[in-house]
């Protein structure tokens, strides 16, 4: 009976999410493998988040709006492990917008989800950020490593969206 009611709840939750995400990829997790964590297909998952790499070239504002429509934000990177996971799926000759910007050009960087900007957990390339006119951040491959660079927000780039996993 307990299992039956849990299955019914899951199905109704799945139907609810299906309006927004036609297909979900779910894995069983938790102490008793009773919880399912899901990401929209074909998003990838790492820890408690889902990631989508958009190859559409758009300005930073349009990229953020695009993520927002999918229930996500431009990616907020919190750890080196997270960055290493993300970069496995990126092309080394491309640049991708992050959810990091400095709209006033005062070098007051801010994450789109209001996560406090911690200078100690940043992965800027050497010499970056280097211009108050370049108010949006990208991640790109330079000098044999992935790192961040400040760029002009209005110039189209690829982007990375991030959302919390869906638990059912």
């Amino acid at each position: 009976n307990f299992m039956y009611s849990k299955t019914v709840k899951r199905l109704s939750k799945l139907q609810e999410y299906q309006q927004y995400y036609p297909s979900l990829t779910c894995v069983m997790e938790g102490k008793d493998m009773e919880d399912w964590s899901c990401c929209p297909t074909p998003w990838t998952s790492f820890q408690s988040s889902c990631y989508f790499i958009s190859t559409v070239m758009q300005s930073w504002t349009k990229s953020q709006n695009n993520c927002s429509v999918m229930g996500a934000d431009l990616v907020v990177i919190n750890t080196k492990e997270e960055q290493d996971f993300i970069t496995q799926n990126l092309k080394i000759n491309s640049a991708y917008f992050l959810g990091l910007s400095d709209p006033k050009g005062w070098r007051h960087w801010q994450w789109v989800d209001q996560t406090p900007y911690n200078k100690n957990v940043t992965f800027w390339h050497s010499g970056e950020p280097n211009s108050p006119d370049e108010r949006c951040a990208i991640i790109n491959f330079r000098s044999e490593e992935w790192g961040w660079n400040d760029v002009h927000c209005h110039v189209p780039q690829k982007s990375i969206c991030k959302m919390k996993k869906i638990y059912i």
Partner: antibody
Framework: EVQLVESGGDLVKPGGSLKLSCAAS????????MSWVRQTPDKRLEWVAT????????YYPDSVKGRFTISRDNAKNTLYLQMSSLKSEDTAMYYC??????????????WGQGTTLTVSS | DIVLTQSPASLAVSLGQRATISCRAS??????????MHWYQQKPGQPPKLLIY???NLESGVPARFSGSGSETDFTLNIHPVEEEDAATYFC?????????FGGGTKLEIK
Amino acid sequence: EVQLVESGGDLVKPGGSLKLSCAASGFTFSSYGMSWVRQTPDKRLEWVATISSGDSYTYYPDSVKGRFTISRDNAKNTLYLQMSSLKSEDTAMYYCARQLYYSYGYYFDYWGQGTTLTVSS
Amino acid sequence: DIVLTQSPASLAVSLGQRATISCRASESVSFHGTHLMHWYQQKPGQPPKLLIYAASNLESGVPARFSGSGSETDFTLNIHPVEEEDAATYFCQQSIEDPPTFGGGTKLEIK
């Protein structure tokens, strides 16, 4: 006082080349992004090229990409536009303009008086 | 590219009256309360001159009779009261994404 003075406009045959210059004064030239904007005979304004303050980025619309090259000499306070494979539709008044960034975009806060390019056989 | 459509193409306004010029964008040029639409004035034989930036901010030295408003896709330039020296062509421009684009212009005549 901010001043931008363009020069180099001329009558050129289709397929020809020309280099425009813009001498800047009255501000710290090296600190600003600069653009070329043209005004066609029917008075429409069209962005042609942008160069960032540090000379690290250049941007062009598809209509001129591969034919026009924007450059700057910060020591001489001068902006350039090298144009090649010119077409009749490139006929216009060419203005150099200073960019001022605002939030996620920018606007053109000073414009030169312009120099005329005519492409005709 | 974002297309900006200005209307009317031309208008004649009596001295001291209000002139209203509209600029409609093919998609939003706003982001979180910032509106990346700008207005320029151009008189015959002169280059464009910046009047208003970011929809409603008056450029230094521009008379207070000029004002701008709007958000997302619809923006307006108002001139009130109109003076003789305001006879000119007015252009809007967006900069939220490359390429920056301009409206086709509105020619203002003073009656």
